[in-house]
């Protein structure tokens, strides 16, 4: 029954890029400007996504496919299909509701996005700090103190407890 009905439905013959126009005896009409239909048999065309402001156009809208956006430089995409744009920060910073803020001592961020994370605590693995951490880089752990030659010493500062900087509070 469904198959028979679809064969009799004139709208099923309307290809992508058109819509079945009820105002014109169900004739297949092209999608109006700034709209599209990605499948056949549609009774309306969808409005094209507009990429403006924080968004910029990655792919123009066509009669058969929606526009695709990415973010204006200085921001990066979040969410499926770049549904949001979020501010970039510098390495050594994290984004808060107050804007980009430097990582607290004992934490680092080596990217333009994301939160500051605590330096690795080398002593938990029985190792020593070979290279100190910075706001932009994690510590580099070296051999365990027992592996060092006699007389050599190494200090491993503990990673400080902290609240996650990405918290809105």
């Amino acid at each position: 029954f469904e198959r028979t009905r679809s064969l009799q439905d004139p709208c099923s013959n309307c290809p992508a890029g058109t819509f079945c126009d009820n105002n014109r005896n169900q004739i297949c009409s092209p999608c109006p400007p700034n709209s599209f239909s990605s499948a056949g048999g549609q009774r309306t065309c969808d409005i094209c996504r507009q990429c403006k402001g924080v968004f910029r156009t990655r792919k123009e809208c066509s009669s058969t496919s929606n526009a695709e956006c990415d973010c204006t430089p200085g921001f990066h995409c979040l969410g499926a299909g770049c549904s949001m744009c979020e501010q970039d920060c510098k390495q050594g910073q994290e984004l808060t509701k107050k804007g980009c803020k430097d990582c607290c001592f004992g934490t680092f961020n080596d990217q333009k996005r994301g939160i500051c994370r605590p330096w690795t605590n080398c002593s938990l693995d029985g190792k020593s700090v070979l290279v100190n951490g910075t706001k932009e880089r994690d510590v580099v752990c070296g051999p365990s103190p027992a592996d060092l030659s006699p007389g050599a010493s190494s200090v491993t500062p503990p990673a400080p407890a902290r609240e996650p900087g990405h918290s809105p509070q």
Partner: nanobody
Framework: EVQLVESGGGLVQPGGSLRLSCAAT?????NYWMNWVRQAPGKGLEW???????????YYVDSVKGRFTISRDNAKNSLYLQMNSLRAEDTAVYYC????????????????SGQGTTVTVSS
């Protein structure tokens, strides 16, 4: 349709003032954090200020602190940016932008913005 429309830009002399407005349609402004961002000629996009749903929290980029004031009138579905002591480096296209669902909790993403209004500071 969800839309933001900015207005109030123009040419102003250094030291002068301007008030930008942003009219929101298609959604209830009082449910969202709102932001102003700007793009100077040849530069990337820069966040300027934000304000929470009821206006009790407001934050600014360091370069505009003490000079710019963000405000909102939820009854009029409008956002504002009062800009005083304008400098040449404030020359930019200014956009109003809505914080997406969950803004300030697990992200700081902006999901809707307008076409922008141009501010030129020059003598």
């Amino acid at each position: 349709e969800v839309q933001l429309v900015e207005s109030g830009g123009g040419l102003v002399q250094p030291g002068g003032s301007l008030r930008l407005s942003c009219a929101a349609t298609g959604f209830t402004l009082s449910n969202y954090w709102m932001n102003w961002v700007r793009q100077a000629p040849g530069k990337g996009l820069e966040w300027v200020a934000n304000i929470n749903q009821d206006g009790s929290e407001r934050y600014y980029v360091d370069s505009v602190k003490g000079r710019f004031t963000i405000s909102r009138d939820n009854a009029k579905n409008s956002l504002y940016l009062q800009m005083n002591s304008l400098r040449a480096e404030d020359t930019a296209v200014y956009y109003c932008a809505r914080g997406g669902e969950g803004y300030g909790v697990d992200h700081y993403g902006l999901d809707v913005s307008g076409q922008g209004t141009t501010v030129t500071v020059s003598s």
